[in-house]
């Protein structure tokens, strides 16, 4: 999916008012310095591409983020503010249903959510120069 035509300010508002705290709660008990940010993004569409991938695509050691509350809210926000997103995701969801995993919090998942927090921070500050 090409995130170029999303309403970025509406997504930012959704993140600030409905998603950010759920990411913090997921990470509770973890030091903010525990994980290094290894995933970066250069502009808002790129950030959303990376956020989508880290949130919904199972990875080695962390297969379960898609069923977390912050993921559900992300899915809902993208569907509303990215034209055509919901249509492109319907087929993907049918495939995902066949391999739905039980929610398990692993250290790898914590690291992944830490990366997500960094991506969202970058998304919210698009005018900052890339480090």
């Amino acid at each position: 999916y090409d995130f170029t035509n999303c309403d970025f300010e509406k997504i930012k508002a959704a993140y600030l008012s409905t998603i950010s705290k759920d990411l913090i709660t997921y990470m509770s008990g973890t030091k903010s310095t525990e994980f290094n940010n290894t995933v970066s993004c250069s502009n808002r569409p790129h950030c959303l591409t990376e956020i989508q991938s880290l949130t919904f695509n199972p990875t080695a050691g962390c297969a379960s983020l898609a069923k977390e509350m912050f993921a559900m809210k992300t899915k809902a926000a993208l569907a509303i503010w990215c034209p055509g997103y919901s249509e492109t995701q319907i087929n993907a969801t049918q495939a995902m249903k066949k391999r739905r995993k039980r929610k398990v919090t692993t250290n790898k998942c914590l690291e992944q959510v830490s990366q997500l927090q960094g991506l969202w921070r970058r998304f919210n500050r698009p005018l900052l120069k890339q480090q």
Epitope: I24, M69, K75, A77, A79, Q89
Partner: antibody, heavy 117, light 107 residues
Framework: QVQLVESGGGLVQPGGSLRLSCAAS????????MSWVRQAPGKGLEWVSG???????YYADSVKGRFTISRDNSKNTLYLQMNSLRAEDTAVYYC???????????WGQGTLVTVSS | DIELTQPPSVSVAPGQTARISCGGD??????VYWYQQKPGQAPVLVIY???KRPSGIPERFSGSNSGNTATLTISGTQAEDEADYYC??????????FGGGTKLTVL
């Protein structure tokens, strides 16, 4: 303007079935997470069920296995199929647009379901 | 999973400040929303994201959430604010949960 209009409520005997419908207008229905919320006479609000744009569903424990939520995005319509109805299911049923799988920003006017012999 | 506890009733004199509490285990780690419902009408969202007001909701409505308690505050309460108020949050099992409701009486 943004509107949700429920229909299909009425009197039904215990063990019976009923299907509620909710016609949506004024917004891109196919993009939104939609829910049903009920309110028994003189009581508080109780979330019943919700459904994503892609058909992914969620249910309250009290209705799991008896109620089925569905949607037809081509008709901008939300449904609630209620089977094995009990007296405690008697309530006003509200169709609701649940913004971001989160808060409810738009409510219908409600339709009354009465389960009684 | 989380249960939300509200006082059944709160009374306030016109012009005074009304505070309605909503309690739940570690509620401060979740977002809380508040609805106003008048007799015979559907509920109306008055606070979302703990403390944000939807457009059209008067400034006298405010919200806070920390620890185990969320609070809806109505400053300079008016007669038209008399209604039932419900808090709402969510569970780890991805379901929506409401408090039992509080009847606000403006004396």
């Amino acid at each position: 303007q943004v509107q949700l209009v429920e229909s299909g409520g009425g009197l039904v005997q215990p063990g019976g079935s009923l299907r509620l419908s909710c016609a949506a207008s004024g917004f891109t229905f196919s993009s939104y997470y939609m829910s049903w919320v009920r309110q028994a006479p003189g009581k508080g609000l109780e979330w019943v069920s919700g459904i994503f744009f892609d058909g992914e569903t969620y249910y309250a424990d009290s209705v799991k296995g008896r109620f089925t939520i569905s949607r037809d995005n081509s008709k901008n319509t939300l449904y609630l199929q209620m089977n094995s109805l009990r007296a405690e299911d008697t309530a006003v049923y509200y169709c609701a647009r649940q913004q971001y799988f989160d808060h409810i920003d738009i409510w219908g006017q409600g339709t009354l379901v009465t389960v009684s012999s | 999973d989380i249960e939300l506890t509200q006082p059944p009733s709160v009374s306030v004199a016109p012009g005074q400040t009304a505070r309605i509490s909503c309690g739940g285990d570690s509620l401060g780690g979740k977002y809380v929303y508040w609805y106003q419902q008048k007799p015979g009408q559907a509920p109306v969202l008055v606070i979302y994201g703990d403390s944000k007001r939807p457009s059209g909701i008067p400034e006298r409505f405010s919200g806070s959430n920390s620890g185990n308690t969320a609070t809806l505050t109505i400053s300079g309460t008016q007669a038209e604010d008399e209604a039932d108020y419900y808090c709402q949050s969510y569970t780890n099992a991805l379901s929506t949960v409401f408090g039992g409701g509080t009847k606000l009486t403006v004396l």
